[in-house]
């Protein structure tokens, strides 16, 4: 299927001009390659009429141009002084030959309709109303006024001043006069349909002295607006129907042969195919509303219509707006998993794509809610604090410049299952939908923190350990302190070279975090997680409460009250064949003030975990295992 898109049918009248826009995929090659407009002959040959290389055929000389708009990925063909000879089949396309990528366009040029010389032409859109002005001479002021519609043989009454109304115009036609002006009457017809188009005659009086006026009413279907969108991207249908329908229910439907199937309306109807990826914005006082659809699929391509009616369904004679949506399969939006699976108590890390050209845009994550017109309240964002009910378990990690940001949600429950949107305040095409499925956990989590009920004592040393399985051995481990502005990764200090491990003991892989000395600001949520480069993996969370020292408890008395242990990542995996008696010592980390310590230790973790890490008088914290960690202040 060609990725070039344009209007399928273009119609005009002799002497007028047309402007034809063709869309092409957003690539550097496409922006610079030759654009052409050619006419298809009976033999299947397509004869170039105009191209972006400067070629202009004789028959287009002085009346056509082709303009490329690389910033929009479109080119436009303008043709003036149309004649009926211009009716035919054309192609707009890209490439060095006319056999390149193209789109078929049918152009129809009609004759100017012949109308009586004094005819007044009114051109209105379907669903709108028209007010026809009917002048008359003063002597006909007392006479009957009427409007009739010409049929083949006669003129069928629409309405007259004796309050006679044609049944098909009841409730739609009104005859009236304004103020004291006795030389003109008006007929207003509302909710116009195609059937209302035609020739009308206004009349005041009877016989030869009657005043008559010819009126031509043209009722037009709105020209569909072309929308060219990438697969997996997002589209917004901006619908502006006018104040007169501001209080009516609104809908968006998709044409299906003769009918238009409602996709969504403001009365709560929604097509299941669009579950989790559609929203209708609140209506405003001017009758404007918009429908947002994310995660575009091939099958979403088609002809869409928005409208307003109390039923929330398409109704003849009500205003509409139309679009032709093309879904380009050569998408710039990366193909990511649209379903992410998690388990209760576990976590998910969701990679959200954004337009790499907009790395400074603000990133957001919202949860789609289908009730009413649908909502997507933002749960977290670059500058948007985490919503209160997600405290301690949700964070957004922006990785500037690489076209991806990550949202991590942990402590999952089945309530978290649903649809979520990734979006920015920039290019709205890059909105994507993720479905989160949460199953009941059937085994222990991969990451486990001990102690689980964490209460640290002010001024003392406190260590928490995060146990991870061997499969995470090669991944980077981290601790971060959560706040409603994000999860700040605690700096780690790699202690010495890693040793190769003969085997990996499932029970002994851990990364520890030590708070030394504990302060009131240390209270809060901490996450232990794994990542590989910029790709985040699993996390687990723990809340550390800080309480005052109770009388009689031991305490650390550092020489410098402000001194705090640095986060040190001591990664030592011990060969399981080495006996505990060998006491492999970890190098002294040295004095680091006001910081945190992370330790990542090997197979004597059990003993480290069991130890109380009581502080000695000089402020050193020691583990009671055969490994000694000296933290000098």
């Amino acid at each position: 299927k060609s990725p070039i898109f344009g209007p399928q049918e273009v119609s005009s009248i002799e002497g007028d001009s047309v402007s034809i826009t063709c869309y092409y995929p957003d690539t550097s090659v496409n922006r610079h390659t030759r654009k052409y407009w050619c006419r298809q002959g009976a033999s299947g040959m397509c004869t170039t009429l105009i191209s972006s290389n400067g070629y202009l055929s004789k028959e287009y000389s002085g009346r056509a141009n082709l303009i490329n708009f690389p910033e929009n990925n479109t080119f436009v063909i303008n043709i003036e002084q149309l004649t009926q000879d211009d009716t035919g089949s054309y192609k707009c396309g890209l490439g060095t030959s006319n056999r390149g990528l193209s789109f078929d366009v049918s152009l129809e040029v009609s004759q100017v309709p012949e109308l009586p010389s004094d005819t007044h032409v009114y051109t209105k859109d379907i669903g709108r109303n028209v007010t026809i002005e009917c002048p008359f001479k003063r002597e006909n002021a007392p006479s009957k006024k009427s409007l009739c519609k010409k049929t083949n043989q006669s003129c069928e009454l629409v309405i007259d001043s004796t309050e006679k109304v044609n049944p098909s115009y009841i409730g739609r036609a009104k005859l009236f006069m304004k103020g004291t002006d006795l030389t003109v009457f008006y007929v207003n017809i509302s909710h116009l349909t195609h059937n209302d188009a035609g020739l009308y005659i206004c009349q005041a009086g009877e016989g030869p002295s009657a005043d008559k006026k010819n009126v031509d009413l043209q009722v037009l279907a709105p020209e569909p607006e072309l929308l060219y969108k990438d697969l997996r991207s997002s589209v917004t249908f901006e619908c502006d129907l006018g104040r007169e329908v501001a209080n009516e229910a609104k809908y968006l439907c998709r044409m299906n042969k003769e009918t238009c199937d409602v996709i969504i309306n403001t009365l709560g109807k929604r097509d299941p195919d669009f579950e989790g990826r559609i929203l209708i914005t609140p209506k405003d006082d001017n009758g404007r509303f918009s429908v947002l659809i994310t995660g575009l699929r091939k099958e979403d391509a088609g002809h869409y219509q928005c409208g307003a009616h109390s039923s929330g369904l398409p109704q003849e004679g009500w205003p509409i707006q139309t679009w032709q949506l093309f879904v380009n399969e050569e998408s710039t939006i990366p193909n990511r998993r649209s379903v992410v699976k998690g388990v209760t108590g576990g976590s998910v890390a969701i990679a959200c794509p954004y337009n790499p050209k907009e790395s400074s845009s603000l990133k957001y994550w919202c949860r789609w809610e289908g009730d009413g017109n649908g909502h997507c309240p933002v749960l977290v964002g670059t500058q948007a604090q985490v919503q209160e009910e997600y405290e301690g378990r949700l964070a957004l990690f922006d990785q500037p410049g690489n076209g991806t940001y990550t949202v991590i949600l942990n402590q999952l429950t089945t309530e978290d299952a649903g649809f979520y949107w990734c979006l920015t305040n920039g290019d709205s095409r890059w909105r994507t939908t993720i479905e989160l499925q949460v199953a009941e956990a059937t085994r222990e989590p991969n990451l486990e923190v001990t102690p689980q009920n964490a209460t640290a004592v002010l001024g003392e040393t406190f260590t928490v350990s995060c146990h991870y399985p061997c499969k995470f051995y090669s991944q980077e481990k981290y601790w971060c302190k959560w706040s409603n502005k994000g999860c700040h990764i605690l700096p780690s200090h790699d202690e010495g070279a890693r040793q190769s491990s003969v085997s990996c003991d499932q029970s002994s892989q851990l990364v520890s975090m030590t708070l030394n000395p504990v302060s009131k600001e240390d209270e809060g949520w901490y996450w232990c997680g794994v990542k590989q480069g910029q790709t985040y993996g699993e996390t687990t969370a723990i809340y550390i409460a800080v309480e005052e020292r109770t009388r009689g408890s031991s305490h650390v008395n550092p020489t410098d009250a402000n001194a705090r242990a640095k986060v040190a990542l001591e990664e030592e995996v011990v060969d399981s064949s080495i006996s505990e008696k060998e006491n492999k010592a970890i190098p002294n980390p040295g004095p680091f003030a006001n910081e945190r310590e992370i330790q990542n230790v090997g197979d004597q973790a059990q003993e480290n975990r069991a130890s109380g890490d009581a502080g000695s008088a000089d402020g050193q914290s020691r583990s009671s295992s055969s490994k000694h960690h000296h933290h000098h202040h």
């Epitope: 609140p282 957001y364 909502h375 997507c376 604090q385």
Partner: nanobody, 131 residues
């Protein structure tokens, strides 16, 4: 409830520039669409500029288009109005206003130039442009 405090007003010569700031109190600044209005002596209060809660959408009165720029910093709970090429007719008290829209995708681009749609107002800051 949000409190709005404008600052940055003052006396400036025609052709000069000023930058107004509006600091908002409260945790939920990013659930408000913000606007600037002004009132010249003896005249009605009129719309100047508005910005959506994300900052992704802005709107301006015709009289200031191309000269004034509205922006916001949600991390600092502040909205700004950069006023360049000032004219004597820009002299007025400038008010900052907040409309509760909620942090929702459906309101991401919502901006309003209608006074009655705003829920909170600042006290105003005087801007005087001399010729």
């Amino acid at each position: 409830e949000v409190q709005l405090v404008e600052s940055g007003g003052g006396l400036v010569q025609a052709g000069g520039s000023l930058r107004l700031s509006c600091a908002a109190s409260g945790r939920t600044f990013d659930s408000y669409a913000m606007g600037w209005f002004r009132q010249a002596p003896g005249k009605e209060r009129e719309f100047v500029a508005a910005i959506s809660w994300t900052g992704g959408s802005t709107d301006y009165a015709d009289s200031v288009k191309g000269r004034f720029t509205i922006s916001r910093d949600n991390a600092k709970n502040t909205v700004y109005l950069q006023m360049d090429s000032l004219k004597p007719e820009d002299t007025a008290v400038y008010y900052c206003a907040a409309e509760v829209v909620g942090r929702d995708v459906t309101t991401m681009y919502r901006v309003s130039g209608l006074e009655y749609e705003y829920d909170y107002w600042g006290q105003g800051t005087q801007v005087t442009v001399s010729s």
